[in-house]
Every structure is written in structure tokens, then in C-alpha cells.
């Protein structure tokens, strides 16, 4: 699942890991876009170990993973990959 | 406001099941990221983590336990439990109740339980 | 499994008093360290979480910090109510473990 959120909320990561996941190992995908009290965008990654990390945005491997999810949905999928919630 | 109680019998012999009973308010089990889990501390010493149920039913044990405990829950009832058998004396301790869930920052064991102290006695 | 050594296991100290209780990893935990306040006859309530940061509504004389695989938790100026059993845990990898805790009493 890849989201992302539009929220109100300050910045949810208070560090960030630029370590490889392989997508097997990936459960779900949140990104939360820069603004709206954040001055950074910021990427949560669940893990199916039931961990959560975030991941640092200007690292390559989640640059491509995004890529791909973005490809795939968006030639797989009548909707849109990008689910906005506004609270 | 989230509160998680503990129940159990407060004594029992060596070689029984212990089986206790976690009942929580304020939140669910059954969002994405939700997840129940038991600790113990036996008198004046540390702590100790012995196993985690997830929302999607995903278990995790301590290993050092693991062919002992067997943890569930009542996802309707807002319950979860903790089976502990053939207790022996190293087993009295309290054991606490607690929360965790996965959101950013993730604080596993945000809340916790008031405990309920077990004691293990011939 | 990941060891957490915590040390003391026990101190003393005054109203005032600068304190700090550390913890250390035996593998790599990359800041998932939780330090615990229990008070006497209390369950555990978060402290500090990801090593550094202030759980809310926890007093500014609390700091956590890190140098390599060392965590510390300091209180700069002690106050009555900071007197009880302080406890890491790392939540790196399964099984999380605790440290063996810390007991903080007035001289």
C-alpha cells in the first residue's frame, strides 16, 4: 500500500535510516509531503516484522522503489496511487 | 483515555497454567498497527518482555519462554490473554499489560497496566 | 539476543545532584532505546523515546543521549519526585530486551 497524507500534524520522524529494505520485506508505505507543519517531506516504512522506520526521502533505493509503485499503479489501477486524506 | 487492567489468580503451585486476562479501553485491536503485549517483573528485580499480538493476529514470544506461553486476544471484547504453563517459583512476578502501536514516533509500551502480582508457592 | 548493561544498578544521591544512568548495547541499536520511569509501587511510564527525545509532559532536567553503543540518561539538578527505578529497553530487533534497571535513591 502506497499513501500519501495531508495532515496537520508537526514532523512525525526523529530519525531517519537511508538502509536498504527489500520489498518483501516492506508491508506498507506512508508519505507525508513538506508544509502543513513539517518543513521536510517524510517517508514511514512498516515492515512485516511489525517495525516501523523511517526512511531518508534523498536515498536512492526508496527513490526507485516510489518509481516503480508509481509505474505499476498507475498502469494497473483506474485510481489514482495517491490517496489524499485531509483530516 | 487508555487503560489496560490485569486479572489473574494471585497464587497458584508449581506445574499449573497460569492464565491471565487483559481488558482494555480507549482503543481497539483492530486498526492496522494496534498490538497488545505482556511484561513481568518479579520483586525488586528488572524487567522482563514476554510476548506481543498484533491487530492481524501476528504473535511474537520471548524465545527464552517460547515453548511456554501462548498469547491471544478478544478482539470484540477488547481482551487479550496470556497462557504461561508449568509454572515454577522463578514465575512470581507482576506482570503488566501493555500497548503498543505502530505509528511515527513509534513508543512501544506507551500504557501500561497497574500489574497483577502472581506468586508461584508449594 | 541484544544485551542491554545497565549501570548503576543502584545509587544514591542529593537534591541537586546531576545524575546519569547508562545503558549499553552489545549489537548496534541505532537509537531504538526507550528509557522507563517506575515509581515505587507504579507501573513504568515512558521517558525518553529513540534515545534523545522527551516523552510528553516529562520535566526539561531529563535528557537522553548517545555515544556509540552507550546510552545515558541524566537528570541535571535531582528533585524529590525523581526518586525511582530507571529502565532501558531496546526495541532494535526481537526479543526487545530491558536493562537490568536502576534504582535511584536520596542521600
Known amino acids: 500500500v502506497l499513501e500519501v497524507y495531508y495532515t496537520s500534524l508537526r514532523c512525525r520522524c526523529v530519525q531517519e535510516s537511508s538502509v536498504f529494505i527489500p520489498r518483501r520485506f516492506i508491508d506498507r508505505i506512508q508519505i507525508l509531503p513538506r508544509g502543513n507543519g513539517c518543513p521536510r517531506k517524510e517517508i514511514i516504512v512498516w515492515k512485516k516484522n511489525k517495525s516501523i522506520v523511517c526512511v531518508d526521502p534523498q536515498a536512492e533505493w526508496i527513490q526507485r522503489m516510489m518509481e516503480v509503485l508509481r509505474k505499476r499503479s498507475s498502469s494497473t489501477l483506474p485510481v489514482p496511487v495517491f490517496k489524499r486524506k485531509i483530516p | 483515555q487508555v487503560t489496560l487492567k490485569e486479572s489473574g489468580p494471585e497464587i497458584l503451585q508449581p506445574s499449573q497454567t497460569l492464565s491471565l486476562t487483559c481488558t482494555f479501553s480507549g482503543f481497539s485491536l483492530s486498526p492496522y498497527g494496534m498490538g497488545v503485549g505482556w511484561i513481568r517483573q518479579p520483586s525488586g528485580k528488572g524487567l522482563e518482555w514476554l510476548a506481543n499480538?498484533?491487530?492481524?493476529?501476528?504473535?511474537y514470544y520471548n524465545p527464552s519462554l517460547i515453548n511456554r506461553l501462548t498469547i491471544s486476544k478478544d478482539t470484540s471484547n477488547n481482551q487479550a490473554f496470556l497462557k504461561i504453563t508449568n509454572v515454577d517459583t522463578t514465575d512470581s512476578a507482576t506482570y503488566y499489560c501493555v500497548r503498543s502501536e505502530l505509528v511515527m514516533p513509534y513508543v512501544p509500551f506507551d500504557y501500561w497496566g497497574q500489574g497483577v502480582m502472581v506468586t508461584v508457592s508449594s | 539476543d541484544i544485551q542491554m548493561t545497565q549501570s548503576p544498578s543502584s545509587m544514591s544521591a542529593s537534591l541537586g545532584d546531576r545524575v546519569t544512568i547508562t545503558c549499553q548495547a552489545s549489537?548496534?541499536?541505532?537509537?531504538?532505546l526507550i528509557w522507563f520511569q517506575q515509581k515505587p509501587g507504579k507501573s513504568p511510564r515512558p521517558l525518553i523515546y529513540?534515545?534523545?527525545n522527551l516523552a510528553n509532559g516529562v520535566p526539561s532536567r531529563f535528557s537522553g543521549r548517545r555515544s556509540e553503543s552507550n546510552y545515558s540518561l541524566t537528570i541535571s539538578s535531582l528533585e524529590s519526585e525523581d526518586m525511582a527505578d530507571y529502565h532501558c529497553l531496546q526495541f532494535k530487533q526481537y526479543p526487545y530486551t530491558f536493562g537490568a534497571g536502576t534504582k535511584l535513591e536520596l542521600k
Open positions: 499480538i498484533w491487530w492481524d493476529d501476528d504473535k
Open positions: 549489537q548496534d541499536i541505532e537509537n531504538d
Open positions: 529513540y534515545a534523545t
